[in-house]
Amino acid sequence: GSAVSSPVLFSPVGRRSSLSSRGTPTRMFPHHSITESVNYDVKTFGSSLPVKVMEALTLAEVDDQLTINIDEGGWACLVCKEKLIIWKIALSPITKLSVCKELQLPPSDFHWSADLVALSYSSPSGEAHSTQAVAVMVATREGSIRYWPSLAGEDTYTEAFVDSGGDKTYSFLTAVQGGSFILSSSGSQLIRLIPESSGKIHQHILPQGQGMLSGIGRKVSSLFGILSPSSDLTLSSVLWDRERSSFYSLTSSNISKWELDDSSEKHAYSWDINRALKENITDAIWGSESNYEAIKEGVNIRYLDLKQNCDGLVILAAAWHSADNPCLIYYSLITIEDNGCQMSDAVTVEVTQYNPPFQSEDLILCQLTVPNFSNQTAYLYNESAVYVCSTGTGKFSLPQEKIVFNAQGDSVLGAGACGGVPIIFSRNSGLVSITSRENVSILAEDLEGSLASSVAGPNSESMIFETTTKNETIAQED
C-alpha cells in the first residue's frame, strides 16, 4: 500500500483560549464566539441548553463523570451520575421548541457512560423530530439493559440482563438495523439485542470468523494457553454504516466487519491491522531516519478510533517510540477502502501535526470525529482541545489548527456531528460548532507554500514552524 504522509508543517498552535472561566454554562447571546481561532469560527450551537442540562452541569462536581453522546439524528444525550438527559439539538420547522427528557439509568457498580446509550429512529431517514419516533436503549457495564420503545413515555420501559457470567464489561451500545442494537464488550464479544413487540428483548451473540483467534472461545483458547487474563483483544471503537448495513469493530489487532439484516448477521471478514498497517504508519513517521530498520522494532502503535467518510474507513492511530528524545505521540489518520468482502491494499497514512509529549499509555486519550461524509476534514479531540486536520485523501485541505478549551473548569465532554457540522460539548459552554472561515480551504499541494509565506508578527501568539524532518518536530502541550 502507499503511505502518503503530510509535510511536517505547523499551523498556529500557540494561541490561547479566551473561554469564560465560569463553571456554569451561560447562553447570553445566541451563537456568540467561544474561543479565539485563526481559521475557524467556534460558536455556540443551536438554541440555549434545556434547564435540566444546565442544572446537571451546574450541580456536577469537578470530578463527577459527565459524558455526552451527540447523535447524528440531531439529538444529544448527557449522562450525569444515574441520570440520562436527552434533548433535541437540531431544531427544524416542525420542532420549534426544544424537547428534553430525563430518564433513570439502571443501577451499576460502575460509572455510567454515554457510550452505552443508543437512540433508534422509526423514520427511515435516520432522524426524528418527535419523541414519539425515538426509541432509547441503555446498558450498564455489567450488562443490565433498559429499553424505552418511545421517548414520549419515560415510565414505560422493559429491562433485560445480558448474562456473561460476570466475565465481561461492556463498552459500547450501537443502534443498528431494524430498531435493534449491538452491545459490545471490552473484550470484543458482540451481542445483538432485538426488542420484540411483546416487550421481550431477544439476544444473541454475533458470529465470529471461522478459524480466527478472535473468534475462538475463552474455554478453548485458555486450553491452548493462547490468552492470559490480561491479553484479551481490547475493543477501541465500533462503527455502524447505515447505507451498507455493515457493522465494524476496531480492536488492538484487527478490524472485523459484519453484514446485518433485520434479525441476523454474517461475519464478512477480520483484517489484521497490525500486519497490514504497522509498517505503513512507521514508514510515514520515521521512514526518513537513517537507522529506520532498528527504529522499526521499537515502535508502539495504538488504534484509538474508527470513523468513515466517502473515501472509506478512517482509523485514528497513535504511534510512539520510547527511545525517541523527546518521546512524542504521533497521531495519524489512516484511510482504507472497504471493497465489500475485504480491505483494499491502498492505504493512506496522514501524519497529523498534533504531536504531544508521550507521558504514559494510559494518557493517550484522543478521539476522532469525521462530521461530513463527503469531505476529508477530521477533528481529533481530547479533554482540553480539538485539533482540526485532514485525512490527506482529498484535493483540498483545511489548515490544521488546535482549538483549546482550557479555561478554568472547562473540558471537552464529547463530540459528534449534526448535519455535517462538527459539534463539541464543552463543560462551560455547552454545544459548540466549529466551522471554517470563508476561503480558508487550500489545495493540499499549496499547503506548504501558504504556511511558509505566512508571517507571524513579533507580538503575535501564533507561531508557524516549517520543518522537514521528524527530529525537528516541535512538541505541543497535550
Epitope: 460502575f110 454515554a114 471490552s186 494510559d362 486519550l365 479533554e383
Partner: nanobody, 120 residues
Framework: QVQLVESGGGLVQAGGSLRLACATS????????MDWYRQIPGKQRELVAR???????TYADFVKGRFTVSRENENNTVYLQMNSLQPEDAGLYVC??????????????WGQGTQVTVSS
C-alpha cells in the same frame, strides 16, 4: 504506570481462611471498580467478587457468605477475606481494576495473580 500486585495466597487446609491483598499504584482507587477473578487451568475465568465505585459489593453465588471483599482507599489496597475454604476454591486469584477515564472510556488493568491451594 498502573500496577496491581496480589499477595496472601498459599496452601491452606479445608475449612481454613486466607486474606488476599491487591496493592495498587497509578490509579485513584476510590474511582475504580475492583474485581477478584479465579482462574483454573482449562476452565473459564470466573468473577469471584467485585467492589464498585459506590462501595457496593457483589459476589459469585459459590462464595456468598464465605468471602468478603473490601477496600482501603487510603492504602490503595483491596482485600478478599476467604473463609471456610474448600478444595474447589483453589486456583489463581487475579485482581482487576476498571478505571473510567476521559469520555467515559474504561481502561482495565490486571495483576499477575496469587495462587491459592486448599488441601483436603
Amino acid at each position: 504506570q498502573v500496577q496491581l500486585v496480589e499477595s496472601g495466597g498459599g496452601l491452606v487446609q479445608a475449612g481454613g481462611s486466607l486474606r488476599l491483598a491487591c496493592a495498587t499504584s497509578g490509579i485513584l482507587l476510590s474511582k475504580a471498580v475492583m474485581d477478584w477473578y479465579r482462574q483454573i487451568p482449562g476452565k473459564q475465568r470466573e468473577l469471584v467478587a467485585r467492589t464498585g465505585i459506590r462501595d457496593s459489593a457483589t459476589y459469585a453465588d459459590f462464595v456468598k457468605g464465605r468471602f468478603t471483599v473490601s477496600r482501603e482507599n487510603e492504602n490503595n489496597t483491596v482485600y478478599l477475606q476467604m473463609n471456610s475454604l474448600q478444595p474447589e476454591d483453589a486456583g489463581l486469584y487475579v485482581c482487576k481494576a476498571a478505571v473510567t477515564g476521559v469520555f467515559g472510556r474504561l481502561s482495565e488493568h490486571w495483576g499477575q495473580g496469587t495462587q491459592v491451594t486448599v488441601s483436603s
